[in-house]
């Protein structure tokens, strides 16, 4: 549950990701936003980054949390099939911003059931540690739908 | 582990300029966004400027918007801080502060530069 | 902005005993799409740097002590220490992360 121990690498697409829309009429506004004109702006700005910034901190909570473990337990988990090895090694793969735009390339829960499943077999499988708990957080008391809904709205996929 | 030292405070004359500093190590400095938050005894703790890892996105708070601007050198590992038409208001300790994974959230302070203005 | 206050102003509690602050924001703070409450708190030693103790009102950052521990929801929130320690004597502030970055206005603990 460390901060200071992230995976940089995997943190940097933050900032960046949560520039304004490149939309030809907001042209000015975003103009104005990266040169912080408006204290609002940064609200916006904050807005944006926390559902990517919750999503980051899950894979670095996991990630720290397996580079603590023991090597030959991990192996053992994966060969028991209590580790879903190939969710896992896809997630600890790739960056956060790659990971929200496989959440968001469906447009809802209907429209992606296998991910939203693999989502949720994650957390089910997950149940001894934080990962788990975050994961249903979002899965189980708020709904996956909702919360992917949100991330369409904001437009992450659409940021350059 | 990480370290953050402010430098250039001093004591300047309202209407003047200075320009603080924070050097940072023990940390990919160009991966994390860095803020400015100062610390005046009347008024606690005040946050002052933002600026994203990748310099695209700067902000500020309304006490100092166009007066101050925040930059960074990454190649440098190097925070600045840029105060024009400093009045007595902006006396305070200035600090340099790391950005968590998580946006506005600190996880590393420096030590802070006192700044006076005063004639 | 949201307005944070805390109380009490200064507290003074005896070592081994619990010491508890409070805080409160002028608006919620806590962010449905996760339930989570944007709520984090410092310490400030003398000559020392500012330290982040909890963050999401109730996650100890790493390497600080178990007896630290936060709690709250919404506006209303709570800085305990279970059992005071000599090295605790600082002043204590919360801040809110959900929107523009304000802090309460501090809370000096010493020791009776």
């Known amino acids: 549950r460390s901060l200071q121990d992230t995976e940089e690498k995997s943190r940097s697409f933050s900032a960046s990701q949560a520039d304004p829309l490149s939309d030809p009429d907001q042209m000015n506004e975003d103009k104005r936003h990266s040169q912080g004109t408006f204290t609002s702006d940064y609200s916006k700005y904050l807005d944006s980054r926390r559902a990517q910034d919750f999503v980051q901190w899950l894979m670095n909570t996991k990630r720290n949390r397996n580079n603590i473990a023991k090597r030959h337990d991990e192996f053992e988990r994966h060969a028991e099939g209590t580790f879903t090895s190939d969710v896992s090694s896809y997630l600890e793969g790739q960056a956060a911003k790659e990971f929200i735009a496989w959440l968001v390339k469906g447009r809802g829960r209907r429209d992606f059931p296998e991910e939203v499943a693999i989502v949720e077999e994650l957390g089910r499988r997950h149940a001894d540690g934080s990962f788990s708990d975050e994961m249903n957080t979002i899965l189980d008391n708020l709904a996956a739908r909702d919360f992917i809904n949100w991330l369409i709205q904001t437009k992450i996929t659409d940021r350059k | 582990q990480v370290q953050l030292v402010e430098s250039g405070g001093g004591v300047v004359q309202p209407g003047r300029s200075l320009r603080l500093s924070c050097a940072a190590s023990?940390?990919?400095?160009?991966?994390?966004?860095m803020h400015w938050v100062r610390q005046a005894p009347v008024k606690g703790l005040e946050w002052v400027a933002f600026?994203?890892?990748?310099?695209?996105?700067?902000f500020y708070a309304d006490s100092v918007k166009g007066r101050f601007t925040i930059s960074r050198d990454n190649s440098k590992n190097t925070l600045f801080l840029e105060m024009n038409s400093l009045t007595a208001e902006d006396t305070a300790v200035y600090y340099c502060?790391?950005?968590?994974?998580?946006?506005?959230?600190?996880?590393?302070w420096g030590q802070g530069t006192l700044v006076t203005v005063s004639s | 902005d949201i307005v944070m206050t805390q109380s009490p102003d200064s507290l003074a509690v005896s070592l081994g005993e619990r010491a508890t602050i409070n805080c409160k924001s002028s608006?919620?703070?806590?962010?449905?799409?996760?339930?989570?409450?944007?709520l984090a708190w410092y310490q400030q030693k003398p000559r020392q740097p500012l330290k982040l103790l909890i963050y999401?009102?109730?996650i100890r950052e790493s390497g600080v002590p178990d007896r630290f521990s936060g709690s709250g929801s919404g506006t209303d929130f709570t800085l305990t220490i279970s059992s005071l320690q000599a090295e605790d004597v600082a002043v204590y502030y919360c801040?809110?992360?959900?929107?523009?970055?304000?802090f309460g206005q501090g809370t000096k603990l010493e020791i009776k």
């Open positions: 801040q809110q992360f959900y929107s523009v970055p304000t």
């Open positions: 600026i994203s890892n990748d310099k695209s996105n700067t």
């Open positions: 608006q919620s703070v806590l962010y449905s799409s996760n339930n989570k409450n944007y």
């Open positions: 023990g940390f990919t400095f160009n991966t994390y966004g």
């Open positions: 502060a790391k950005e968590s994974i998580l946006a506005a959230l600190f996880d590393y």
């Open positions: 999401w009102a109730s």
